[in-house]
């Protein structure tokens, strides 16, 4: 696949990834009544990381904010955090990855510049992709936890159900947004590491022939190929490296530029 | 004003079939979830079926299900119920009744009798 | 199914009087995602259909008179009529608005002395 094409690909599938990540924090869906007990329920619940919703049978929905922060479990706090983290660091991402991509041309800048902003914007997106699954997954163990904990409530509080009446707990399952934070995330994290093998290929070549060096006798001596080996474009200059059959290469050599006779 | 008109209500022999309209106005009937309560001579209501408003979630009661089926026509604003392998039992006041916030019946039509007798 | 049992079955009283009436539940109508409690109260006078007075078991609907107040746990509900008067002569049922299949009390009939 080509540079471009892959860099392109790796925005794209970034782009829909941190668009899911957005979705998903915003989605009132985060956890679902279990309807096990009950599949014909006449009021459903669901949850999201800012507010809580009911639906009535009747089509009615009523939703309330969480208007508190101390009031609120840690984890969900913390959930709230890694998918606020996720699509800070996407949006910085995008926002570096379109001064990065090949296909548009800001000013002068050279590849060397687009190739170091591909690789950052490349791992901007993979640590928002991270955030994104971590948080999805810290809900999600969160709520099998509470599920088991309700579970277990349910066949233990009830008096060995000696008593006429039965005390229905609420429980809660996946909700829709865990899954689409979950696919997001992962999206964004392949597309961050297509950006980062991108990367590679962008590193200033001037050719993509095969290189070869001259002694000043004109003696045709070992040459290796040019193109895309190892070229993060950070470090060392990694130029062509010329091999000469004898002696020290000199600084001159490392950043000497090529002549009309440096190609055959 | 709100009004629901029931009909097609009558005398029908044990097995045999019928079909009750509801007739709607005063209201945006595609917005809301209908049902079909029935109250037998001299006793209490009975929750009989429920149409969501676009028709996507239908329920039955126990008593009724596999041989009654309730529809609507939001184009018509009229709610069916079509009963079928009718028994002596089924004797009832049909009402359909509008479902609203609270889940609860807020306006009743004047309802329509329904015999099963041979 | 939820069974609601109402009691008493019938209840005679004068004009000015205040009344209650119960409607017991075998399952709790308490909603835990908003905390309402699904239980409605319906007026039916004779020959008439019945008429929605109480929703979300406190809520007075549009219309009702302040003299109708509903309460309860999300088990054991009250009608209350502080002070009857001669058109409040009816069945009241009580009904779950909670689960399918929706359920009725079998009602308590109101009559004058």
């Known amino acids: 696949m080509s540079v471009t094409a892959c860099q392109g690909l790796g925005f794209v599938v970034s782009l829909i990834g941190f668009a899911g990540i957005i979705a998903a924090t915003c989605m009132d869906q985060w956890s679902t009544q279990d309807l096990y007990n009950n599949p014909v329920t006449a009021v459903f619940n669901y949850q999201g990381l800012w507010r809580s919703c009911v639906r009535e049978s009747s089509g009615f929905t009523e939703c309330r904010g969480y208007f508190t922060l101390l009031g609120l479990p840690a984890m969900l706090q913390a959930v709230r955090a890694l998918m606020i983290v996720g699509i800070v660091l996407g949006v910085i991402g995008i926002l570096v990855s379109i001064f990065a991509l090949k296909c548009i041309r800001i000013g002068s800048m050279d590849d060397s510049a687009k190739a170091k902003m591909t690789l950052t914007s490349g791992i901007l997106f993979i640590i928002s992709g991270i955030s994104a699954i971590i948080g999805v997954s810290v809900f999600a163990n969160m709520l099998v936890t509470n599920f088991w904990m309700s579970t277990a409530n349910m066949y233990s509080g009830m008096g060995g159900m000696g008593g006429m009446v039965q005390t229905v707990q609420t429980r809660y399952t996946f909700g829709a947004a865990l899954f689409v934070g979950w696919v997001a995330g992962g999206l964004t994290l392949i597309g961050g590491v297509m950006m980062c093998i991108a990367c590679r290929g962008l590193t200033p070549d001037d050719s993509n022939f095969k290189a070869v060096s001259y002694h000043a006798s004109g003696q045709n001596v070992a040459y290796r190929p040019g193109g895309f080996k190892a070229s993060t474009g950070f470090g060392s200059n990694t130029r062509n490296k010329k091999i000469y059959d004898g002696g020290a290469r000199t600084e001159d050599d490392e950043q000497s530029h090529p002549t009309k006779y440096d190609y055959v | 004003e709100v009004q629901l008109v029931e009909s097609g209500g009558g005398l029908v022999k044990p097995g045999g079939s019928l079909k009750l309209s509801c007739a709607a106005s005063g209201f945006t009937f595609s917005d809301y979830g209908i049902h079909w309560v029935r109250q037998a001579p001299e006793k209490g209501l009975e929750w009989v079926a429920y149409i969501s408003s676009g028709s996507s979630t239908i329920y039955y009661a126990d008593t009724v299900k596999g041989r009654f089926t309730i529809s609507r026509d939001n184009a018509k604003n009229t709610l069916f119920l079509q009963m079928t392998s009718l028994r002596s039992e089924d004797t009832a006041i049909y009402y359909c009744?509008?479902?609203?916030?609270?889940?609860?019946?807020?306006?009743w039509g004047q309802g329509t009798t329904l015999t099963v007798s041979s | 199914d939820i069974v609601l049992t109402q009691s008493p079955s019938s209840l005679t009283v004068t004009a000015g009087e205040k009344v209650t009436m119960s409607c017991k539940s075998s399952q709790s109508l308490l909603n835990s995602g908003n905390q309402k409690k699904y239980l409605t109260w319906y007026q039916q006078k004779v020959g008439q259909p019945p008429k929605l007075l109480i929703y979300w078991a406190s809520i007075r609907e549009c219309g009702v008179p302040d003299r109708f107040t509903g309460s309860g746990s999300g088990t054991d509900f009250i009608l209350t009529i502080s002070s009857v008067q001669a058109e409040d002569l009816a069945v009241y049922y009580c009904?779950?608005?909670?689960?399918?299949?929706?359920?009725f009390g079998a009602g308590t009939k109101l009559e004058l002395k």
């Open positions: 009904q779950n608005a909670y689960s399918y299949p929706l359920t």
């Open positions: 009744a509008k479902w609203d916030r609270g889940n609860c019946f807020d306006y």
